[in-house]
Amino acid sequence: AGVFELQIHSFGPGPGPGAPRSPCSARGPCRLFFRVCLKPGLSEEAAESPCALGAALSARGPVYTEQPEAPAPDLPLPNGLLQVPFRDAWPGTFSLIIETWREELGDQIGGPAWSLLARVTRRRRLAAGGPWARDIQRAGAWELRFSYRARCELPAVGTACTRLCRPRSAPSRCGPGLRPCAPLEDECEAPPVCRAGCSLEHGFCEQPGECRCLEGWTGPLCTVPASTSSCLGLRGPSSATTGCLVPGPGPCDGNPCANGGSCSETPGSFECTCPRGFYGLRCEVSGVTCADGPCFNGGLCVGGADPDSAYICHCPPGFQGSNCEKRVDRCSLQPCRNGGLCLDLGHALRCRCRAGFAGPRCEHNLDDCAGRACANGGTCVEGGGAHRCSCALGFGGRDCRERADPCAARPCAHGGRCYAHFSGLVCACAPGYMGSRCEFPVHPDGVSALPAAPPGLRPGDPQRH
């Protein structure tokens, strides 16, 4: 476990002609904030793929108002580091995505509006525990200067944060069951990771991958009771006086989880389950409100109007997790037929069809459509020896000559109006509701349903479909 840290030094117009004067010209005052997304490996991943290593959002920067005659400056930035905790090993190779967002502070319905100003992607190799790496990146006409590093958090050490160590409890020797953690003289190494499945209660190991049983237990994983013994149930190093194994420290000893979080042991480490309103490796991050935009991937933040009340993220289809940070693997359902390749684009699933097949799910054999015509932009699809038309939006019937109503299913909730726009259906919500389908009340139970950022939904904010 550890933390990836990013420090933004400056963001402003890049050199050369055509550089923008301001991020918010003609839009009134605005302020900046940053989102960092970490993905494992060096591959060119789709922008929409999940931030599997983690993501973080900065605080808002100071308000910026363009001075018409002033030279374009570096823009006022949020204070502090962006920190992305990671639970597992640091992969060494990773993709770093930094997004610069503009928050417009004009008179917006339901609060400010957000838009993406710049996005840089770096694919790098980086060892944990190393020095800060500095970088300058251009994004369009903007220039971003930043530094980053990865550091382990005790008990993890090493370039991948996989060696488990604890500080010495005494100047001259390690605590029970711990050895000095070479070459780090001020730390001690925790017991090695035992064989998978080795009983946490009745087994232990001195070398990685082994499973030695405590007295009174037997079997390859120490799960079979043997003869009874006064030492039963104890684990740890042998006691010279009793010959019994005495309890050694476990990862959850002393409960490393703050703020009422509950600790559960994982192989060689621990995991905290945090109460609502807290998150982080040890539930140490608190005071987060909807105004901080904790919901990723377009999640809608509800509640959390002040630091003392918890927020909840309502995730859009395809995402899950307390902050909508995890992508649901919709391709695992194998929706593409006839050998089609499934691509999860985030906003939609797409199938890349093999030659001779077509349709949203590659379900149509193209051979039966020779010489067949579909009106109004419809496409012909095979249907058991007979052709049929897959009609463009707004049309229906056998040959797509009839008008169809995308609003027929009444998709706009709570009295919202659905319009059959050429770009897809559009909802106009009744007063008091918001969301692309008017599904969220603006003031449920007296608590304002604040939108997530970025980009989030604004009250009554329509979306194209």
């Epitope: 917006q108 509006a113 109006r417 319009y419 770009s423 106009a428 904010d461």
Partner: antibody
């Protein structure tokens, strides 16, 4: 080709009544739109009067138009505007227009002139 | 809901740039449900821009809309003689309410 055509305009005396009709072709009101009436007095800008939402028949009016103007759907291709207690200030070209999303009028009729005069 | 357009009239040379402002007394629905129309004598208004910045199909790219909330702008870059007309902004508001601006006459010399 989608089209709107207004009819029913003409000369009417003050305090008189008139019903305008908007006829659609190339599409029908089975889809969901706001079918609206907008008027424009000579030399002035357009002024929204009222709409009927074809999805459920609900109606909306400009505050000044409530009571004297009534919009209704007569058939799957016609919408009417009933006007009562007409005054000289109601003299204008009356347009039928369609909002099919994002609150703008993407389709207009050519308009019909209503003159209120004694 | 009142939409105020400035300036009127506005004059530009062929190839010049015209900027028209539209201010609303309250935020339009979704902060961007505002459209711009061009009208010539004897014709109904013709939509140029919808949803503040989206160009209607078939409209030349020299027309550009921007803004959000209560403040919006229509810019004509490289004005042509054919652009001489009256331009109107129109907003849609929560509660299914529509309103038009007073109009800006554009003269191209």
């Amino acid at each position: 080709q989608e089209q709107l055509v207004e009819s029913g305009g003409g000369l009417v005396q003050p305090e008189g009544s008139l019903t305008l009709t908007c006829t659609a072709s190339g599409f029908s009101f089975s889809s969901s739109y706001d079918m609206c009436w907008v008027r424009q007095a000579p030399g002035k800008g357009p002024e929204w009067i009222a709409c009927i939402y074809t999805g459920d028949g609900s109606t909306d009016y400009a505050s000044w138009a409530k009571g004297r103007f009534t919009v209704s759907k007569a058939s799957s291709t016609t919408v009417t505007l009933q006007m009562t207690s007409l005054a000289v200030a109601d003299t204008a070209t009356y347009f039928c227009a369609r909002n099919s999303g994002y609150g703008y009028f993407g389709l207009w009729g050519p308009g019909t002139l209503v003159t209120v005069s004694s | 809901q009142v939409l105020t357009q400035t300036p009127s009239p506005v004059s530009a040379a062929v190839g010049g740039t015209v900027t028209i402002s539209c201010q609303s007394t309250e935020s339009v629905y979704g902060s961007d449900w505002l459209s711009w129309y061009q009208q010539k004598p004897g014709q109904p208004p013709k939509v140029l821009i919808y949803q503040a910045s989206n160009l209607e199909i078939g409209v030349p790219s020299r027309f550009k809309g921007s803004g959000s909330g209560t403040q919006f702008t229509l810019t004509i870059s490289g004005a042509q003689c054919d652009d001489a007309a009256t331009y109107y902004c129109q907003g849609y508001y929560s509660g299914y309410i529509y309103a038009f601006g007073g109009g800006t006459e554009v003269v191209v010399k």
